[in-house]
Amino acid sequence: VPDKTVRWCAVSEHEATKCQSFRDHMKSVIPSDGPSVACVKKASYLDCIRAIAANEADAVTLDAGLVYDAYLAPNNLKPVVAEFYGSKEDPQTFYYAVAVVKKDSGFQMNQLRGKKSCHTGLGRSAGWNIPIGLLYCDLPEPRKPLEKAVANFFSGSCAPCADGTDFPQLCQLCPGCGCSTLNQYFGYSGAFKCLKDGAGDVAFVKHSTIFENLANKADRDQYELLCLDNTRKPVDEYKDCHLAQVPSHTVVARSMGGKEDLIWELLNQAQEHFGKDKSKEFQLFSSPHGKDLLFKDSAHGFLKVPPRMDAKMYLGYEYVTAIRNLREGTCPEAPTDECKPVKWCALSHHERLKCDEWSVNSVGKIECVSAETTEDCIAKIMNGEADAMSLDGGFVYIAGKCGLVPVLAENYNKSDNCEDTPEAGYFAIAVVKKSASDLTWDNLKGKKSCHTAVGRTAGWNIPMGLLYNKINHCRFDEFFSEGCAPGSKKDSSLCKLCMGSGLNLCEPNNKEGYYGYTGAFRCLVEKGDVAFVKHQTVPQNTGGKNPDPWAKNLNEKDYELLCLDGTRKPVEEYANCHLARAPNHAVVTRKDKEACVHKILRQQQHLFGSNVTDCSGNFCLFRSETKDLLFRDDTVCLAKLHDRNTYEKYLGEEYVKAVGNLRKCSTSSLLEACTFRRP
């Protein structure tokens, strides 16, 4: 019989008492085969973290800073359940740390040196740890003691709770630096008042502070937020302009064998019976013998943290950077305006080899990082382990939802001004063998399908989106008799046609021979009835253009396109017979890397782009013999995006809407995780 006990860790007598009450009340409402609670008492949160890691306890609820400690080795804990605040309809699990300034003050984030600062309190998250952590490497040396470095960075501050004797500049704007509401500039509202009164130039607070203190929109319009990319935004655009997104209070568990499903089952049942306004005799979010015992008193309920989300992703790049800077106190030798090497994310073995060759030739400008799937690469870019990669539009959508931005677009047509003219896109098509003359768009049911990969534009999002509109369900593996759609569940019929060996079968990378445009076409040639690819795929792999044994004798005339009106046309008539127009592949990165990725890639394409005539002996960035490694092989150049610099603007309203409709069919664990952070 599996043990269905969750050992909850308590950090005080009062918490232990509430835990026992929690245990007893759960017993009275949950059947004997359901989850139960046991209580483990420890002296501190850090002791609880160690106990969970050592399998002496299973769960504890932590503030963000402690979630970071819990994630560090050797603890390796992960977030499993989040408390939410506000309403069930609009649950808030995060708050945003922001830098508020007056509208007419005219300086940016990188010009804070010498300004006057207002903080909620020394050592507090939004008011101190996050802003000072992010500014850490700009502080004058020596950076220890930290208070002294901060005092020398700003021209005056109010940092309640600081030592006014040792660091008088930190109390310059609020004499005495009182650590309670007796100090008018203490806490969130106090720090904002410090700015409002004109004592300070910038206030480090929560996104809600300004709304709580200024009910009138006209008054709020006198203030702006400083963004990390050295721009400003209105105060209501805090989701796109903040220092960090911080989880409020989170239940953590072991990463391996952590009982996360059991913990969720327990807490979900607990909130049903003892949540807000549910029961008089025991209330989960109430602490008669103290404050915030086990859970925050202000919490309204729990949400399950998506399983793909580790602590780094949950806390977010900015928060982790800030806390790591404060804890480790390490900075690059001397901050320079020069760009650090761009860490390119390579998918599996073959891309890694090409990336290594690029790295050797780039002379220190490109480094390589490997991952097994596109989603793993996106996650690595999010958390700073990697910086950039080029993505199909379907993954540009996921990357965008995860906070990344497009920076350059692949262009596929030769033109005089290639780098300045991003193209409208390419065509997604359905290809069949000419010999299968009875096959049309209207009778694909039961046929064998070949896809570039799940989540990609031409191979999945466009054809499956159109199919979904017709069949109104997501069981595509039942619609086709079998197929190869790399990235599908291994036991799905949509992995049956794939050719990868062993663990590589149906993997969404080049270890699966039927992956990508060329792979999907090969799948059609060898096994399938229809392939969903781009309009250039057939000509690029026929007429001897692909020297591989399976392709060298193929003839373009032996293939036709399926049109949406039920007719068929020759391959060259793609402009009048396609499924939809697809946005070109694009390079994505984090916002903080945007300028450097743009600069370095433009240099790199001038050295190794289409201007290189002999690729047999020289490195060519856009060549890999139809394998589309790192970039599509038909890329002519990487083009500036001009104002199409967000994923929505880049992909266009129509495509974003189409992918949004397919979301209900999405199996993307990363998309689920990212929409948890930003619904």
């Epitope: 060759e357 030739n361 047999s616 890999s624």
Partner: nanobody, 117 residues
């Protein structure tokens, strides 16, 4: 396709040195990038050092300051001088010319380097 043959491996004590050679069956003068990789048991193959035709080099962080890559186009050979060897340098070392534009698995036999006391 140029064939590459690696040699020079062996058993050496920590702190010792070895010089690996990679002899090509044809001219390497027109080949831009040559590189040494290594693969330890149960690990992924990783880039150790690379050199371009112009003599620009790149090294893995773990070997910087200890290993030196060089090429002699006249002798159609690429070398890897390995000093101050450590137990974690134990692996099979392979040479590549990246000449297959689609980066398939065309590796030679490699040469075994074992660093142990």
């Amino acid at each position: 396709q140029v064939q590459l043959v690696e040699s020079g491996g062996g058993l050496v004590q920590p702190g010792g040195s070895l010089r690996l050679s990679c002899a090509a069956s044809g001219s390497i003068a027109s080949i831009n990038t040559m590189a040494w990789y290594r693969q330890a048991p149960g690990k992924q193959r990783e880039l150790v050092a690379g050199i371009t035709s112009g003599g620009s080099t790149k090294y893995a962080d773990s070997v910087k300051g200890r290993f030196t890559i060089s090429r002699d186009n006249a002798k159609n050979t690429v070398y890897l001088q390995m000093n101050n060897l450590k137990p974690e340098d134990t692996a099979i070392y392979y040479c590549t010319d990246y000449s297959k534009r689609y980066y398939q698995d065309y590796w030679g036999q490699g040469t075994q380097v074992t660093v142990s006391s």
